[in-house]
Structures are given as C-alpha cells and as structure tokens.
Interface confidence: low
C-alpha cells in the first residue's frame, strides 16, 4: 500500500487532522520536499542579520549580514564584526596587525610576512600591515654590490600572529 502522504508535493504537508489531505504550508513556514507531515518554520533574519532570500512555501529564507559584519558558520549562522585591512578582531575589538604580520581582508587573522630567504629570495617590496612582502630574485641573481635584504619573520605557528 502506498503512503497517501507521498503524494503531497513540496510546499504542502500531509494533514492528519483532515484525513491526510495535502494542505498548503501556513504563512511563514515551508516544506522543501514532498511527503512531509509538517512544515518547517521560516528562518527570520533579525537584528544584525538581513534577508538575502525571502522564505517561500518550498524554501527557507536565507540571511546575510548587515554592512560592517560578515557571515560565519554554515548557512550564515552568525554575523561577525568586520575589521579594516591591516587589523584582526581580538577580544577587545579590532586591533592593528603587529609588525611583521599582515591581513589583506576585513576578516580573519593577521599572518606573518613571507620569509623570502627560506626560498633563497630577497625582499623586492617590503610588507605592510595590509600587504605581504613581495619576494624578488635570489640574492645570487644580483650583480656584485647590489644591496639585498630580507625581512625577519616573527616566530609562532604558520599563519598566526606574533609580536
């Protein structure tokens, strides 16, 4: 015997109170697959969240974040404060990257400048809080007497800030 509820399409639910008739999802609810016995409540994008896609009878609302914040987590489960380039978000708010580190995005952490000398290269362009160093040719590629320098890279785990 076929389950009569299997005939209920997305956007409806199988109403046990009405002899398993397919009833439309009530306002502010949805069912994204057929054969559902209930409709799910639509997500509401409140506060720092804003609506990216309205809820429909067959799909949930989608949220993103208001300006100055960015999404974190699956399906934008949380909004996290943006910082400026050259900063990272600390427990005390946005703070400038320490010397020897950079962050070229409005989110994430300050990362150590590339150590050009590890690849046998020299620093072509110095790093800043917002930008990594640019490595140039190896020092041996320079003619004698050409100055070449490498920037020190702070200690600590790769991809994490030191002071």
């Amino acid at each position: 015997l076929q389950d009569p509820c299997s005939n209920c399409p997305a956007g409806t639910f199988c109403d046990n109170n009405r002899n398993q008739i397919c009833s439309p999802c009530p306002p502010n609810s949805f069912s994204s697959a057929g054969g559902q016995r209930t409709c799910d409540i639509c997500r509401q994008c409140k506060g720092v969240f804003r609506t990216r896609k309205e809820c429909s009878s067959t799909s949930n609302a989608e949220c993103d974040c208001t300006p100055g914040f960015h999404c974190l987590g699956a399906g934008c489960s949380m909004c996290e404060q943006d910082c400026k380039q050259g900063q990272e978000l600390t427990k005390k708010g946005c703070k400038d990257c320490c010397f020897g580190t950079f962050n070229d995005q409005k989110r994430g952490i300050c990362r150590p400048w590339t150590n050009c000398s590890l690849d046998g290269k020299s620093v072509l362009v110095n790093g800043t809080k917002e930008r990594d160093v640019v490595c140039g040719p190896s020092p041996t590629d320079f003619s004698p007497g050409t100055p070449s320098t490498t920037m020190p890279v702070p200690g600590g785990e790769p991809g994490h800030t030191s002071h």
Partner: antibody
C-alpha cells in the same frame, strides 16, 4: 616550552596572595595567557587572562576587583585579595596554542601542573 | 553572559564502546568550541579546537561536531586510557560576548 605556577600555600581568610606563572622557551608577549582554578573535586573555573602583546586583561565577572593579572617579559602574576575558604583550589596557568591577538587563537595547549592554594582559619 | 552547559555529568561505557558528550552554549558561538581531557592530578589537555580540528597527537577516535549552540564530542573504540573528565570551552568573543566561565561543567567518562 613550559609554564610553571608557584606561590600557592596555606593562608588565613582575608590574606592577600600572589601566584606567579613562569614561562620557559617562549616569550609571553606573543600569546594569550590564562588563569583557571579547580576546587577539590570540582570543574574548571576561568578566572581571567592577559594578552601579552598589549597587556590587556579580561576577567570573569565574579573575579573582577578581587583578582588582578599582570605580566613581565617572562612571568604572569595573579594577585588575589580578600581570600575566603571558597577560593581553596588548584590554580593553573596556561598558554594559548597560537600566538596572536585574534580571539580565534583562544585555546590552550600548554598548561602548568598547578599550584595549590588553601584558605583556612 | 554566555553559559556553557555539558551533559551528561557522568557516563559509563565498556572498552571498545562509544560515548557521546554534549555541550550547549546559551547563545551562538559559531564554531569557536574546544574540548579538553583531564585526568586526576593532571592539568587539562587540549583535544579539539574550532569544533572539529584535532590537536596533534590526538587519535582520530575523538571526533568533534556541531555549530552555533549545540556541540558534540564522540569517543569511539573506547580504551581504558580514555577514562577522564572532559570539558568544553567556548571562545567566541565577538560582539562583546562575555563568559562567566568559558568552560563547561565537565563530563566524567568511566570505562568498564
């Protein structure tokens, strides 16, 4: 790399006490350092922390005013005042896994063995 | 303040079995959750951070999952050495989040 707590002892209620966490093999200026305590048979209780890069501190609401965290280049101190019997515990110091001020780095993989503070009359 | 709540307080399982420990945050902490193991007379040991990233040297029998407010630590193929108390720690400090205690209350795992 290691951290070691010292200064724990038996004191009477009301006595101030300062615990010291000594770092070996790394510089405190790169890390979050945390103080946590554990009463006998109880769970871990966060007291507060200091970020070595900026010397900024943060405290649990219950610890504010009575506990003060400060640092030198190689030590982190926990100064405690108005001690009561409820403060009897093993006090742990720990260092963050990663260097840097981002709170994404606020997990701790280097712990001391703890120092026991007993407050009794 | 964000409150970290662990359940159950104690769980018992046989060698080779599986245990599941739950940690609930009173508001969303995204994926900023860590798990620690503590044995009697020892300091805590970091097992997992950012919800599911294993600390180096931690066996893959330990698995972390979840996001937002609900998190789970699953220990499979239990060994007697896994007998310990396990703590979760929330560390999402965005939006001026506060914690009275960043650690959960702990779950004792007894291995039979």
């Amino acid at each position: 790399q290691s951290v070691e707590e010292s200064g724990g002892r038996l004191v009477t209620p009301g006595t101030p006490l300062t615990l010291t966490c000594t770092a070996s093999g790394f510089t405190i200026s790169s890390y979050h350092m945390i103080w946590v305590r554990q009463a006998p048979g109880e769970g871990l209780e966060w007291i507060g922390d200091i970020y070595g890069g900026t010397a900024t501190t943060d405290y649990a609401s219950w610890a504010k005013g009575r506990f003060t965290i400060s640092k030198t280049s190689t030590t982190v101190d926990l100064k405690m005042t108005s001690l009561t019997t409820e403060d009897t515990a093993t006090y742990f110091c720990a260092r963050a896994r990663y260097s840097g001020g981002s709170y994404a780095n606020y997990v701790f993989n280097l712990w001391g063995q703890g120092t026991l503070v007993t407050v009794s009359s | 303040d964000i409150v970290m709540t662990q359940t159950p307080a104690s769980v018992e399982a046989a060698v080779g079995g599986t245990v599941t420990i739950k940690c609930q945050a009173s508001q969303s902490i995204s994926s900023y959750l860590a798990w620690y193991q503590q044995k009697p007379g020892q300091p805590p040991k970091l097992l997992i951070y950012r919800t599911s990233t294993l600390e180096s040297g931690v066996p893959s029998r330990f698995k972390g999952s979840g996001s937002g407010t609900e998190f789970t630590l699953t220990i499979s193929d239990l060994e007697s050495a896994d007998a310990a108390t396990y703590y979760c720690q929330g560390y999402d400090w965005s939006s001026s989040n506060r914690y009275d205690n960043t650690f959960g209350g702990g779950t004792e795992v007894v291995v039979k």
